[in-house]
Amino acid sequence: EVEKTACPSGKKAREIDESLIFYKKWELEACVDAALLATQMDRVNAIPFTYEQLDVLKHKLDELYPQGYPESVIQHLGYLFLKMSPEDIRKWNVTSLETLKALLEVNKGHEMSPQVATLIDRFVKGRGQLDKDTLDTLTAFYPGYLCSLSPEELSSVPPSSIWAVRPQDLDTCDPRQLDVLYPKARLAFQNMNGSEYFVKIQSFLGGAPTEDLKALSQQNVSMDLATFMKLRTDAVLPLTVAEVQKLLGPHVEGLKAEERHRPVRDWILRQRQDDLDTLGLGLQGGIPNGYLVLDLSMQEALS
């Protein structure tokens, strides 16, 4: 807390300018009017204030706006944003995407800080849902943003926003996040034709159930091995050799290189060896001919 001292004669600030960098902390406190600071916040960024001086300026704004800063001030905070605590930010009501962009720009190139996380949370909650423009903005600054959301937050993403998602935005997603996103993607892309649909849905297939993979296998999609390797093991295991062959098309030859890795390894162990042999790839480890296979899906259909 800076002590209240009178402003020396002739030092009262008429505007926010470069001369203020020569002011001591107590002089800034005494000679800069908080209301003036609030109206000229856009100038602060252009002036090389020290961290200590920025602390004083923040203190002045805090006194002027104890219930939280108005958006007109927030939009021009610039580097002063880095001085804010999550508790400060929780008092704000940020509604403009331009304000959000301006503050994210300050933190650009750095990991998402608790301050930024709180800001985004406040912004999204204020909007009620994660719309396409917001998602576009957030993933541009933080490609892993989508994968940092809770199941509840993801479930509030409208299918229309899925169009903004790029494959790299899903790189760090947990299978449980893909579970939530996949049905939304399916809905978002449902009116596209077969090949276009597959291009769009590909990144989300880590959340696809077996039935959908079976359906895709009937559509000549030619899934590449990289995508196949990202599929859920539990979704791949019930697929027949014929279904996997149709799903991969010409890429089926890639199974040989991946036969020791999941989900290919586990899938091989579930197939009859003579079915695997029909692929002509030399895949080994299937169920020997003559052994009884307990087909759970068949049993399900019979009961």
Partner: antibody, heavy 121, light 112 residues
């Protein structure tokens, strides 16, 4: 307020298939962001996670049970089910269904009362 | 699989006194999203488990504030500030960071 209730036979013969259903009331199984789990507890022992299903039909199974296990969902009936084949005495346990998700993983906030399944001839 | 080890196996406590249960995981529970999905559940005799704490220290709604969770990485603690008669039961830690989800072996809290 969401409630879960397990149902199914209390006695299953060895080598047969154990079938249980969990009925969800007070909320929709299709409301996004929740994962519908099966967990079991062997007599006098700790808890073992079996697997979960999302309303879309996507599943994740415990690898120790993979191959014998099918979890399915029927959104029209607001139910999800467990089928465990080739059972042995080691599958004797109290089987619970539970809801996970919401604002975190591991937030298993709603549990069924549990149903005791004995595997015996 | 991540192995969850709880100590002690049993904890006899005097009513009104504090109790502490430790849980250690075989590897870090920090998820790629930087959260740590460690929960604590209580199971009273003859009842299903009940959620107490999730994400290390978040108390679930309706859970008395005498229950608190702490820890990081691989070491976690559940504390009961003043044990009441209704707290008798088995307490489990659970990790939901990595599949398969796994539970600790349980700690039995009983009154001396």
């Amino acid at each position: 307020q969401v409630q879960l209730q397990e149902s199914g036979p209390g006695l299953v013969k060895p080598s047969q298939t154990l079938s249980l259903t969990c009925t969800v009331s007070g909320g929709s199984i299709s409301s996004g962001g929740y994962y519908w789990n099966w967990i079991r507890q062997h007599p006098g022992k700790g808890l073992e996670w079996i697997g979960y299903i999302y309303y879309s039909g996507s599943t994740y199974y415990n690898p120790s049970l993979r191959g014998r296990l099918i979890i399915s969902v029927d959104t029209s009936k607001n139910q999800f089910s467990l089928r465990l084949s080739s059972v042995t005495a080691a599958d004797t346990a109290v089987y619970y269904c539970a809801r996970d998700g919401g604002d975190s993983y591991g937030r298993m906030d709603v549990w069924g009362q549990g149903t005791t399944v004995t595997v015996s001839s | 699989d991540i192995v969850m080890t709880q100590t002690p196996l049993s904890s006899p406590v005097t009513l009104g006194q504090p109790a502490s249960i430790s849980c250690r995981s075989s590897q870090s529970l920090v998820h790629s999203d930087r959260n740590t999905y460690l929960s604590w559940l209580q199971q009273r005799p003859g009842q299903p488990p009940r959620l107490l704490i999730y994400k290390i220290s978040n108390r679930f709604s309706g859970v008395p504030d005498r229950f608190s969770g702490s820890g990081a990485g691989t070491d976690f603690t559940l504390k009961i500030s003043r044990v009441e008669a209704e707290d008798v039961g088995v307490y489990y830690c659970m990790q939901a960071t990595q599949f398969p989800l796994t539970f600790g072996g349980g700690t039995k809290v009983e009154i001396k």
